[in-house]
């Protein structure tokens, strides 16, 4: 019903149309130049479409556009409209960026979609020769132009091209940069075997640099090093010490070689070590000092060998900054050879050497053990005068069951009395001396403490009413004295203590109570110490009856009386026998009686009468007397 053309561009159109909402199957659109020069374009589009873009038309050209719809086999009337495409848009501006010595970048502005492509022409200004012609797609706004000459003036023209139209050209004039070249060649950090080469360049992307190193006298072939184009410095190792060199460099960039730069340089002298000296010698150590080229060595190696090759070789690695070393842990009185070499990244110096002899240790000898007793012994030794600061005496039991005992003594002492040890076991004694912080090799001795002295076999004999005899055995020559302690077992009296001189082995004890049980304890004393005691139980004998008397003597009878002993007895037994011989007669009376009548005697006969006290199986000594019977009448 209505056909309109909106947005007529310079190479295309936008169509819009309206139609009632009949179910159109499709629309047919025809686009033709108004002068009918070209064949018409016929398009079929779906019946639901109401707008279409038609690109690809000619610039500044009049067109007739027609449209009809088809619905259920019926064609609507044709709608038509006339329109013209616009004129070709102009190019904007042309600029040059990133001008190098052999290339540049050309940039330009232009309306989007305006041009099919662009035509670029490059002329050398001085010769007006065309050096490049190129066509690029219309979508581009920038292009790189390589392959130019350095320090050369160029005219560059740009045209926009549509299907059938070219714009007026835009031009720009440009001068390419000078050829790249290196500058500022310098040598830093010259060492004895290498150097560092530095250079400067313009800010270009060099492919690589070629560095050439040659001895100034041309004796050796030149070394060529290729290094990446990003570097501006390089280390050159592996050179000869103290040698003049010529170092050259050139850069390579896009096949172009820059002019060569050169410089002359001499390497430093080879690092050296020397003046190896020994000082501060002691029995176990010494100090070393040496000289060396500064700032070169990573490490020094010191090798120490005893002249007799008896000890394992010792090797020490120390920092290259050191010029001294303290060597310790050596044996005394030993000759050593000391070798020193320096180590740098690519060198080990010649080895230098010197000799050293450790001092002799002061003498410590003659370890002697004496005065051995059950509880200790005396340790003595000899040593050089004023040589030792102190001595260490270590005492340990041979079985190593106990903690060692250590005694530190002044350097003037030569003897140690040991007390308080265990009797009858083995001991090991170690004595070492200290001098200037060094400890001598210890002297060693062994001994066994004597067994504990014993008293034994305490015997009781010859019991009497007021005492008894004690006898015992004991080790000879050990005890200074013996002590006897006696106390009645019922603790009714104070204990007695008797001290006896050493040689005695018996003692009569008197002054005790009769028929009393006593505890006896005996021990020996040796150097103020008591031995283990021995014990016994003893009982004093019963007291005997006393003061026997006769009365009422007739020809065939007599009364005998006595005084009873102090202690209670069970009975008295009276024995009487004629002095001239004959069978004895006996009579037993109660222990409480102190007299009895003897009968059936023979007249005129002398009788011996004895009275004994009895208790259990024990009998007292007798008390005796004589009587004579009267004669017959």
């Amino acid at each position: 019903e209505n056909l309109t053309v909106t947005e007529a561009g310079w190479d295309g159109l936008r169509l819009n149309w309206t139609a009632d909402d009949l179910a159109y199957e499709y629309f047919v659109i025809q686009v033709q130049e108004a002068n009918n020069v070209e064949t018409a374009h016929n398009f079929t589009v779906p019946g639901n479409l109401r707008a279409a873009d038609i690109p690809g038309l000619k610039v500044a050209t009049s067109y007739r556009v027609s449209i009809y719809g088809v619905a259920r086999g019926y064609r609507t009337p044709v709608l038509s409209a006339e329109t013209s495409t616009g004129t070709t848009p102009n190019l904007g501006e042309v600029t040059v960026a990133e001008v190098g010595w052999d290339a540049l970048t050309l940039n330009w502005t232009a309306p989007e979609g305006a041009y099919k492509n662009f035509f670029i022409q490059v002329l050398e200004a001085d010769t007006t020769q065309t050096v490049q012609n190129l066509t690029v797609p219309g979508g581009l706004r920038s292009v790189d132009l390589p392959g130019l000459k350095a320090a050369t003036r160029y005219y560059i023209t740009l045209r926009g091209v549509t299907q059938d139209f070219g714009t007026a050209p835009l031009s720009v004039e440009v001068l390419t940069e000078d050829l790249p070249q290196l500058g500022g060649l310098s040598v830093t950090e010259v060492s004895w075997d290498g150097l560092t080469l530095n250079w400067t360049t313009d800010d270009l992307a060099y492919k690589h640099f070629v560095v050439q190193v040659q001895e100034a006298n041309n004796v050796e072939a030149a070394q060529n090093l290729t290094v990446p184009g990003s570097l501006r410095a390089v280390d050159i190792p592996g050179l000869k010490a103290d040698t003049p060199y010529r170092v050259s460099i050139y850069g390579v960039i896009q096949g172009y070689r820059t002019p060569m730069l050169s410089t002359d340089v001499s390497t430093a002298r080879e690092p050296e070590i020397g003046n190896l000296n020994v000082s501060d010698v002691t029995p176990k150590s010494f100090n070393l000092s040496w000289t060396a080229t500064d700032g070169i060595f990573d490490m020094f190696t010191i090798e120490i060998i005893d002249s007799n090759r008896l000890l394992q070789t010792a090797e020490h690695n120390i920092s290259g900054a050191e010029r001294t070393a303290h060597i310790s842990g050596l044996p005394p009185s030993t000759d050593f050879i000391v070798y020193l070499s320096g180590i740098a990244p690519s060198i080990r110096t010649k080895t230098i050497s010197t000799t050293a002899t450790t001092e002799a240790l002061p003498l410590l000898e003659n370890l002697t053990i004496s005065d051995t007793n059950p509880y200790g012994f005396t340790v003595s030794w000899t040593a050089s005068e004023n040589a030792f600061d102190s001595f260490l005496v270590t005492v340990v039991d041979s079985g190593k069951l106990l903690d060692p005992q250590e005694f530190t003594l002044s350097g003037t002492q030569r003897k140690l009395e040991l007390r308080g040890l265990i009797t009858g076991i083995g001991y090991e004694v170690l004595v070492s001396g200290f001098t200037q912080g060094h400890q001598t090799k210890p002297l060693r001795a062994e001994t066994i403490t004597e067994a504990e002295p014993e008293v034994d076999n305490l015997l009781v004999s010859d019991a009497t009413p007021d005492g008894f005899r004690l006898s015992w055995t004991a080790d000879e020559g050990i005890f200074d004295s013996f002590v006897i302690r006696i106390r009645d077992t019922k603790k009714q009296s104070e204990p007695q203590e008797i001290s006896l001189p050493s040689p005695e082995r018996t003692r009569d004890i008197t002054g005790l109570r009769e028929a009393t049980e006593y505890e006896i304890e005996l021990y020996g004393i040796s150097r103020g110490r008591r031995s283990q005691p021995v014990s016994a139980i003893a009982t004093t004998a019963m007291g005997s009856p006393k003061e026997i008397m006769f009365s009422d003597i007739t020809e065939n009878a007599a009364t005998v009386s006595w005084r009873a002993p102090t202690a209670q007895v069970e009975s008295f037994r009276i024995t009487y026998v004629p002095m001239t011989g004959g069978a004895p007669s006996m009579v037993t009376v109660d222990g409480t009686d102190t007299e009895t009548r003897l009968v059936k005697l023979t007249p005129g006969v002398e009788y011996r009468v004895s009275v004994i006290a009895m208790k259990g199986f024990e009998e007292s000594d007798p008390v005796s007397g004589t009587l004579i019977t009267a004669l017959d009448g």
Partner: nanobody, 121 residues
Framework: DVQLQESGGGLVQAGGSLRLSCVAS???????????LGWFRQAPGKEREFVGA????????YNPDSSKGRFTISRDNAKNTVYLQMNMLKAEDTAVYYC???????????WGQGTQVTVSS
């Protein structure tokens, strides 16, 4: 009968490009240049949508809503092939793309099987 075979679809990242091809065969004695060809697409759950067409004389027409200046249709008569160049693809361009011929009648009589285009964002 005319047979059409599309190709060139596939999975592409948003912002990428694809070029679809459609080869015509069995044109019953008529030359390929005698046909106008169109491209259509159908997204899941939506109606088939016109993308654009090329006339026998090589002129092109586009649906502004779908092409938005990103699509270009061209033809190579020597190869019996029509092309759809799609640039700056978006997730909403995901669809099955069909080519169709409008032959002796003016409507689109013959259709290809379609080629799947998936644009991941």
């Amino acid at each position: 009968d005319v047979q059409l075979q599309e190709s060139g679809g596939g999975l592409v990242q948003a912002g990428g490009s694809l070029r679809l091809s459609c080869v015509a065969s069995g044109t019953s004695g008529l030359t390929f240049r005698s046909f106008g060809l169109g491209w259509f697409r159908q997204a899941p759950g939506k109606e088939r949508e016109f993308v654009g067409a090329i006339s026998m004389t090589g002129g092109t027409i586009y649906n502004p809503d779908s092409s938005k200046g990103r699509f270009t249709i061209s033809r190579d008569n020597a190869k019996n092939t029509v092309y759809l160049q799609m640039n700056m693809l978006k997730a909403e361009d995901t669809a099955v793309y069909y080519c169709a011929v409008n032959g002796l009648g003016l409507n689109y009589d013959y259709w290809g099987q379609g080629t799947q285009v998936t644009v991941s964002s």
